[in-house]
Amino acid sequence: KFSKQSWGLENEALIVRCPRQGKPSYTVDWYYSQTNKSIPTQERNRVFASGQLLKFLPAAVADSGIYTCIVRSPTFNRTGYANVTIYKKQSDCNVPDYLMYSTVSGSEKNSKIYCPTIDLYNWTAPLEWFKNCQALQGSRYRAHKSFLVIDNVMTEDAGDYTCKFIHNENGANYSVTATRSFTVKDEQGFSLFPVIGAPAQNEIKEVEIGKNANLTCSACFGKGTQFLAAVLWQLNGTKITDFGEPRIQQEEGQNQSFSNGLACLDMVLRIADVKEEDLLLQYDCLALNLHGLRRHTVRLSRKNPIDHHS
């Protein structure tokens, strides 16, 4: 339950988050599980711990193994395990299955491909995107924040997409790549079980106390006009309007994008003046149509909840 798979390529940066959360946490200690040897926190080391993050800058094949994180507080110590595998870079262009993140689907226009794990890194735009090892060029491709937008998607756009970015740590730059498959849906009009494009299931969104935060629930329901389709947010299983917190509001009216017939809906949840108690709430993005309901849960976490003095 408290174990997580992570993978990366040799000579690239890899950052792994401890799968356990503190309630609260005072410190997080990391160990090599096999030897029980403590991982240093000094940044001069190639592999070092930084609060809830374990950083490989850069990673080596020999780093593969299971790492233990212990979230410590006066009351309880909570243990998690990160199963890390570092692979050699392939000489050819094929990205093996074991390096692939989850597949995403799109259709026709405005399909988004999110760059996996990027939120763990200190990166600056723009991202570089590749398809089957070729750099993407042309006006149909737009790198926007942490995702790629493809306009007028065609069947030929299906394939493996790699995002590449630079992680900066104390002035030193490290390359990171991540690959996921993109599939293109059928051209005819159809209705399908809702597909939530954002947020990811069990996504943890970092927010700053006192600042505003936006969460976007984005889902697609098929192609062509949909008889019934809706996206909405719930707080702890309660409709926003019934929850009774005026700081937290849904954007009036849903954005409807008929991307060459693909019916997608967005609903933005706006949280004004984020408070501590907001971190305890469960935020559910719900997408529903005649096929049924799909729910993705988002949690908020305070930026750098452990490393307060950095």
């Epitope: 609260p24 501590e276 971190l279």
Partner: antibody
């Protein structure tokens, strides 16, 4: 909005046991430790112990070991504290209090008044 | 156990003026992570305690910025810049550095 709703006042005989409850709402129950605090005019606020509802793990103030037993029911988001072998010294207001990811005692119940008297 | 010491009463203050409440711990509350685990709570008459300040100097959500706190590892001061009638109650300091967590005996804010 986070709420901790505690059970009503109790009047019990010396030597008996009593169970106080605390129902949590407005947040994910297993994501917050539940602590219990005793308040009397003589000793002020005293920390009794805590439970992690996710695992059922407990930790106690040495002073209250054998006196208090903490439990949590995930299905009903309710934490409970049983107090045994009651004496007049146990007469007090008892609070449940929840933690956040950053600190303990962030949210407090309204308190349960326990009176031990023959 | 860490002992938290407070005076039972504050010096009486006039509404609109500032007030200070002191607290001392028997051991430094500075953790190796650089955080001082000192907390301030206010218990208004007939109510439960409510968190004012966490980790020595951080204002809890919804607490007016009239409240501030400072100190070293063992000596702490809660300051209320412009006392209002609603600030009346007992102020407790507490430590969350180590078990058992302990509270001060409380300081009652008195209005002239």
């Amino acid at each position: 909005q986070v709420q901790l709703q505690q059970s009503g006042p109790e009047l019990v005989r010396p030597g008996a046991s009593v169970t106080l409850s605390c129902k949590a709402s407005g947040y994910i129950f297993i994501d917050s430790e539940m602590h219990w605090v005793k308040q009397t005019p003589v000793h002020g606020l005293e920390w009794i112990g805590a439970i992690d509802p996710e695992t059922g793990d407990t930790v106690y103030n040495q002073k209250f070991k054998g006196k208090a037993t903490l439990t949590a029911d995930k299905s009903s988001s309710t934490a409970s504290m049983e107090l045994s072998s009651l004496t007049s010294e146990d007469s007090a207001v008892y609070y449940c209090t929840g933690s956040t990811t950053d600190y303990y005692f962030a949210y407090w119940g309204q308190g349960t008044t326990l009176t031990v008297s023959s | 156990d860490i002992v938290m010491t407070q005076a039972a009463f504050s010096n009486p203050v006039t509404l609109g003026t500032s007030a200070s409440i002191s607290c001392r711990s028997s051991k430094s509350l500075l953790h190796s992570n650089g955080i001082i685990y000192l907390y301030w709570y206010l218990q208004k008459p007939g109510q439960s305690p409510q968190l004012l300040i966490y980790q020595m100097s951080n204002l809890a959500s919804g607490v007016p910025d009239r409240f501030s706190s400072s100190g070293s590892g063992t000596d702490f001061t809660l300051r209320i810049s412009r006392v209002e009638a609603e600030d009346v109650g007992v102020y407790y300091c507490a430590q969350n550095l180590e078990l058992p967590f302990t509270f001060g005996s409380g300081t009652k804010l008195e209005i002239k």
